[in-house]
């Protein structure tokens, strides 16, 4: 049975040309995690292996760090950047936990972050 | 067109080291990593390890940690390994394979190394 | 280290036939599996990846299916240039592993 819960960021949002850390927490659970992925919408940014390490894909090398943790850092954030994120847990025994996460990119210095929140 | 182009056949003694080369074109280099499997006569493939060309981090098969080391020349696009310590079992084709764009599969491979520990 | 096995280890087939390779893995890897082709002499050749997403360039008579530990790879309209050795391989954990390979040939 799949206890666990993924916090996460939650809504957030940033400014055009900065960077924003997406963060998720898995809890409630002693399983493993074996692997995160990050996607945005369909398109996989990164995968963060407990044993291989990490994986950027070669479209966000440039702008995208790994870390903090199993967390993802995007940088020179465009407007075409706003979306919806995903982070996938892949853990043992539980099987799959996804979070997802809601970034605003903003023309103006107006950005601020969100509450955090949790999902099921 | 994406190249991989390895260094030519080797012939070792037992307790030697060799180091082949790998030298990447056709697309930008520090964006891939690249691994490194070897093939001995006959058997499976078998996976070494990898390595991120723009950070130079690592990971090996636990196998081979003692005895491998991957590195990297940016600046000439090239990535290498190194094994010491051959036996004759380490007779084998030595691969470098580009990662792929979406995980740890490897997408392009080099055209092997024949490397022959024999005394 | 995440055990792979291959079914058959060999198989003889005609051009047209349809062929299915069967990977087995000791535990759960999700859909993260690729196959590959390799003809003697030369370097393996990506066919697959996330156990069912054709590589680029690759005919569409060749499909993979699959998930958490069990994968087939199919020919659906065998072509003399398939005559080969096909391997499987996980790529979830370290070490990645590869399959024994399944060695198809001329009837």
């Known amino acids: 049975m799949m206890t666990g819960t993924i916090e996460t960021t939650g809504n957030i949002s940033a400014e055009k040309g900065g960077s924003i850390i997406l963060q998720c927490h898995l809890s409630s659970t002693t399983a493993q995690v074996t692997q995160v992925n990050w996607e945005q919408q369909d398109q996989l940014l990164a995968i963060c292996n407990a044993d291989l390490g990490w994986h950027i894909s070669p479209s966000f090398k440039d702008r995208v760090a790994p870390g903090p943790g199993l967390g993802l850092t995007l940088q020179s954030l465009t407007v075409n950047d706003t979306g919806e994120y995903f982070c996938i847990y892949h853990t043992y025994p539980d099987g799959t936990y996804t979070g997802r996460i809601f970034l605003e990119v903003l023309e103006s210095s107006v950005a601020e972050h969100g509450a955090r929140f949790q999902i099921p | 067109e994406v190249q991989l182009v390895q260094s030519g056949a080797e012939v070792k003694k037992p307790g030697a080291s060799v180091k082949v080369s790998c030298k990447a074109s056709?697309?930008?280099?520090?964006?891939?990593?690249m691994h490194w499997v070897r093939q001995a006569p006959g058997q499976r493939l078998e996976w070494m390890g990898r390595i991120d060309p723009d950070s130079g981090g690592s990971k090996y098969n636990e196998k081979f940690k003692s005895r491998v080391t991957i590195t990297v020349d940016k600046s000439a696009s090239t990535a290498y390994m190194e094994l010491s310590s051959l036996r004759s079992e380490d007779t084998a084709v030595y691969y470098c394979?580009?990662?792929?764009?979406?995980?740890?599969?490897?997408?392009?491979w080099g055209q092997g190394t024949t490397v022959t520990v024999s005394s | 280290d995440i055990q792979m096995t291959q079914s058959p280890s060999s198989l003889s087939a005609s051009v047209g036939d349809r062929v299915t390779i069967t990977c087995r893995v000791s535990e759960n890897i999700y859909s993260y599996l690729a196959w590959y082709q390799q003809k003697p002499g030369k370097s393996p050749k990506l066919l697959v990846y996330?156990?069912?997403t054709l590589a680029e360039g690759v005919p569409s008579r060749f499909s993979g299916s699959g998930s958490g530990t069990d994968f087939t790879l199919t020919i659906s309209s065998l072509q003399p240039e398939d005559f080969a050795t096909y391997y499987c391989?996980?790529?979830?954990?370290?070490?990645?592993?590869f399959g024994p390979g399944t060695k198809v040939d001329i009837k």
């Open positions: 391989q996980h790529h979830y954990g370290n070490p990645l592993t």
């Open positions: 394979a580009r990662e792929g764009h979406y995980g740890f599969y490897s997408d392009y």
């Open positions: 056709g697309y930008t280099f520090t964006n891939y990593y």
């Open positions: 996330n156990a069912k």
